[in-house]
Interface confidence: medium
C-alpha cells in the first residue's frame, strides 16, 4: 500500500501530502476512510483539501484516522493513504518517541539540522529553535532558512532539537513544532565505491501473477555524511519516470541509515498487480556516488503454486 504516517499536536497546524504523486494538473480527491466521506476543498473549513495537500488548521485529536487520496489523471487513478495521528500537548518537557522525526547525524564539518516537513507550509523566517526545550542562544547557533547550523560541533550538542514556526493561511497564523534527535559523530567520514547489499547480482525473484511485489535496492557508500549518494531503479535501462507504467513506481524518498557506522540508502520498487509481461523486464538496481556507479540486475520469475496432492 502507498501509505504514509503523519502526526501532529492538537491546536497546531498539520499539513499532509498525498503519498501518491502526480502532475500538478491532475485532480486529487480526499476522503476520510472510515466513513468514505469526502473532505471539502473550501478553505473556510477547519480541515480541507488543497490539491495534493490535506490541511488541518488547526488539528484536533478527533481528526486522527486514515485518509484516502485519489490522484486522478485522464488515463489512470492512483490511491494513497495518509495515517494521521493527532496527540494532546505534553505538559512536561519530554518529547515522546512517537512525536520524533528521523534522527540526523552531524560532525564538525557538517552540522545542519533541517526542520522536518517545513517545506509543506507557508512560513516566513526566522525559525525558532529549542534544544531539550531550552531556546538556543549564543553565536554558535545560526538559524538559516529551513535549517539550524551549529558551529564547532561538540559531543555535548547531541540531543533533541525542536523547530517552531508560524504557518500562514489566508491571513490566519497557526503554530507548528517538529522535533528530531541530533547525534554527533567524532570519527572522520570517508567515501568508497558503492557496495550493493541487495539484491544480489543476477538475482531471480519469484512473484505471483496478480499480486503486488516489492524489490528493494540497498547500497552503502562509506562512513559519515555523504555529499553525493543515490540509489534508484531502472527498467530495461530506462528511468522509471520515463518507462510510463503507472503500476511500477519507486518509493519517493530514500531512507538513510547508518548501519555499523556505514552510510546506506535504500529505494523500494513497488509493482502492483504483477503481469506476465513484467517477467520479461530487466530490473536494474543502481547505486552511485562520486566514485562511480554499480549496477545489480534482477529478473522476475513466476512462483509455482504449491502442489496440494496427497
Amino acid at each position: 500500500k502507498f501509505s504514509k504516517q503523519s502526526w501532529g499536536l492538537e491546536n497546531e497546524a498539520l499539513i499532509v501530502r498525498c503519498p501518491r504523486q502526480g502532475k500538478p494538473s491532475y485532480t486529487v480527491d480526499w476522503y476520510y476512510s472510515q466513513t468514505n466521506k469526502s473532505i471539502p476543498t473550501q478553505e473556510r473549513n477547519r480541515v480541507f483539501a488543497s490539491g495534493q495537500l490535506l490541511k488541518f488548521l488547526p488539528a484536533a485529536v478527533a481528526d486522527s484516522g486514515i485518509y484516502t487520496c485519489i490522484v486522478r489523471s485522464p488515463t489512470f487513478n492512483r490511491t494513497g493513504y495518509a495515517n494521521v495521528t493527532i496527540y494532546k500537548k505534553q505538559s512536561d518537557c519530554n518529547v515522546p518517541d512517537y512525536l520524533m522525526y528521523s534522527t540526523v547525524s552531524g560532525s564538525e564539518k557538517n552540522s545542519k539540522i533541517y526542520c522536518p516537513t517545513i517545506d509543506l507550509y507557508n512560513w516566513t523566517a526566522p525559525l525558532e529553535w529549542f534544544k531539550n526545550c531550552q531556546a538556543l542562544q549564543g553565536s554558535r547557533y545560526r538559524a538559516h532558512k529551513s535549517f539550524l547550523v551549529i558551529d564547532n560541533v561538540m559531543t555535548e550538542d547531541a540531543g533533541d532539537y525542536t523547530c517552531k514556526f508560524i504557518h500562514n493561511e489566508n491571513g490566519a497564523n497557526y503554530s507548528v513544532t517538529a522535533t528530531r534527535s541530533f547525534t554527533v559523530k567524532d570519527e572522520q567520514g570517508f567515501s568508497l565505491f558503492p557496495v550493493i547489499g541487495a539484491p544480489a547480482q543476477n538475482e531471480i525473484k519469484e512473484v505471483e501473477i496478480g499480486k503486488n511485489a516489492n524489490l528493494t535496492c540497498s547500497a552503502c557508500f562509506g562512513k559519515g555524511t555523504q555529499f553525493l549518494a543515490a540509489v534508484l531503479w531502472q527498467l530495461n535501462g530506462t528511468k522509471i519516470t520515463d518507462f510510463g507504467e503507472p503500476r511500477i513506481q519507486q518509493e519517493e524518498g530514500q531512507n538513510q541509515s547508518f548501519s555499523n557506522g556505514l552510510a546506506c540508502l535504500d529505494m523500494v520498487l513497488r509493482i502492483a498487480d504483477v503481469k506476465e509481461e513484467d517477467l520479461l523486464l530487466q530490473y536494474d538496481c543502481l547505486a552511485l556516488n562520486l566514485h562511480g556507479l554499480r549496477r545489480h540486475t534482477v529478473r522476475l520469475s513466476r512462483k509455482n503454486p504449491i502442489d496440494h496432492h496427497s
Epitope: 565505491f193 547480482q201 543515490a230 534508484l232 531502472q234 530495461n236 535501462g237 530506462t238 528511468k239 519516470t241 520515463d242 530487466q282 536494474d284 543502481l286 552511485l288 562520486l290 566514485h291 562511480g292 556507479l293 554499480r294 549496477r295 545489480h296 540486475t297
Partner: nanobody, 121 residues
Framework: EVQLVESGGGLVQPGGSLRLSCAAS????????MGWFRQAPGKEREMVAV???????KYADSVKGRFTISADNSKNTAYLQMNSLKPEDTAVYYC???????????????WGQGTLVTVSS
C-alpha cells in the same frame, strides 16, 4: 564511449550571469547523473552541482541559491545557470556524467574537456 562537450564559458563581471551547456554524445546515452565540477588554479577539483535521474539536484554550499542545474533529456544536455557570480567562482568548469549502458556493472564518471569561466572587473 561517451563524449561530453561543454560550452558557454567566458569572461563576466562580478554579479553577472553565465549559462553553461554540456552536450552528451557517443553510444546510446541515458544519463543517470550529470553534473558540473570546477577546478580553480592551484586547487583540487570540486563538485558544484549534480542532477540525478533527471529530478534530484544537489549543490555545493558555496553555490546554493546562485547556481541552478537542469537537464534536457531529449537533447542529452545538462545546463548550469550561474547568477550573482563572484571572483572566487573563477575556474575551469567540467561536465561529468554516468550513463546507463545495461551491460555495465561499474562505470567511472565520463568527463568533458572543460570550459573556462573568469569573473573579473
Amino acid at each position: 564511449e561517451v563524449q561530453l562537450v561543454e560550452s558557454g564559458g567566458g569572461l563576466v563581471q562580478p554579479g553577472g550571469s553565465l549559462r553553461l551547456s554540456c552536450a552528451a554524445s557517443g553510444r546510446t546515452f541515458s544519463s543517470i547523473v550529470m553534473g558540473w565540477f570546477r577546478q580553480a588554479p592551484g586547487k583540487e577539483r570540486e563538485m558544484v552541482a549534480v542532477i540525478i535521474d533527471s529530478r534530484t539536484t544537489k549543490y555545493a554550499d558555496s553555490v546554493k541559491g546562485r547556481f541552478t542545474i537542469s537537464a534536457d533529456n531529449s537533447k542529452n544536455t545538462a545546463y548550469l545557470q550561474m547568477n550573482s557570480l563572484k571572483p572566487e567562482d573563477t575556474a575551469v568548469y567540467y561536465c561529468a556524467a554516468v550513463g546507463g549502458a545495461t551491460t555495465v556493472t561499474a562505470s567511472e564518471w565520463d568527463w568533458g574537456q572543460g570550459t573556462l569561466v573568469t569573473v573579473s572587473s
